[in-house]
């Protein structure tokens, strides 16, 4: 069985302030089981943007229906983009673990740049 890959097809995305940004991510396998998370930035200081397991992320919607048992699309849309949202976003697959899930594989990242709102 081929090992799971995390595919973020776009290296960069440019969005006008006030619009929504779609960040694409797909998995090549459902195994190992475990949640998907999105982060802005890398390393210890990265910011959690979305956690499939839990939490309230009012500006984030998933593009696909994550409750489908065969879902491999973990793309997200972030609404009302501001310049503060600029950065590189990583789609990260975790495998289940106890007490904490273990980071398994990360996408290559998508850099979000924010254009000034058209006047």
């Amino acid at each position: 069985e081929d090992e799971l890959q995390v595919i973020q097809p776009e290296k960069s995305v440019s969005v006008a302030a006030g619009e929504s940004a779609t960040l694409r991510c797909a998995m090549t396998s459902l195994i190992p089981v475990g949640p998907i998370m999105w982060f802005r930035g890398a390393g210890a200081g990265r910011e959690l943007i979305y956690n499939q397991k839990e939490g309230h992320f009012p500006r984030v919607t998933t593009v696909s229906e994550l409750t489908k048992r065969n879902n491999l699309d973990f793309s997200i849309s972030i609404s009302n983009i501001t310049p503060a949202d600029a950065g590189t976003y990583y789609c990260v697959k975790f495998r289940k673990g106890s007490p904490d899930d273990v980071e398994f594989k990360s996408g290559a990242g998508t850099e979000l740049s924010v254009r000034a709102k058209p006047s």
Partner: antibody, heavy 118, light 107 residues
Framework: DVQLVDSGGGVVRPGESLRLSCAAS????????MSWVRQAPGKGLEWLAG????????YYIDSVKGRFTISRDNSKNSLYLQMNSLTAEDTAVYYC???????????WGLGTLVTVSS | ALTQPASVSANPGETVKITCSGG??????YGWYQQKSPGSAPVTVI????KRPSDIPSRFSGSASGSAATLTITGVRVEDEAVYFC???????????FGAGTTLTVL
Amino acid sequence: DVQLVDSGGGVVRPGESLRLSCAASGFTFSSYAMSWVRQAPGKGLEWLAGISAGGSDTYYIDSVKGRFTISRDNSKNSLYLQMNSLTAEDTAVYYCARETWNHLFDYWGLGTLVTVSS
Amino acid sequence: ALTQPASVSANPGETVKITCSGGDYYSTYYGWYQQKSPGSAPVTVIHSDDKRPSDIPSRFSGSASGSAATLTITGVRVEDEAVYFCGAYDGRTYINTFGAGTTLTVL
């Protein structure tokens, strides 16, 4: 509080049909996948079918495929199980259950009894 | 198929462990469901291997390792007498399965 109320059970003859309902309250029904699980008298739990939050994807155990249909109406906060060609082996208490993000169950209905007898 | 013992017994205050085997660790999540009488609604005491719902007492805990899951009740009480079913979701087959149930008797 999360509440799931099963209904629609009763006594039917072999070969007949029945439609079970599950009324949900206390949570955003349209955000959760749901399942039906049954328990025959003196037996264990048996998962029958699951449905995604939007209702587009359904999943069944082999023994009920083609006979049972799971569906939902998110505008009515309701889950359904249409059961056709019933046999005595379908006699059981039927529970609806809310799924967790990874398709286990966190809340259960009270159950509704289906008896198939001639 | 999930395999669990048919019965276990313990004195009040003792620690009880119920095991459930039969799933592949990397494709399976486990849950534990308490049923106090036949035909009554099950209550989820553990889901996602080790997650305890907020209304379940802290004496209930869960773990998974290799091809097995374990439900541990630390300081068992008389009111914990019930049948405990392990359940699993398999990410390869998209199917839920249950063990046959373990009857816990508190002496």
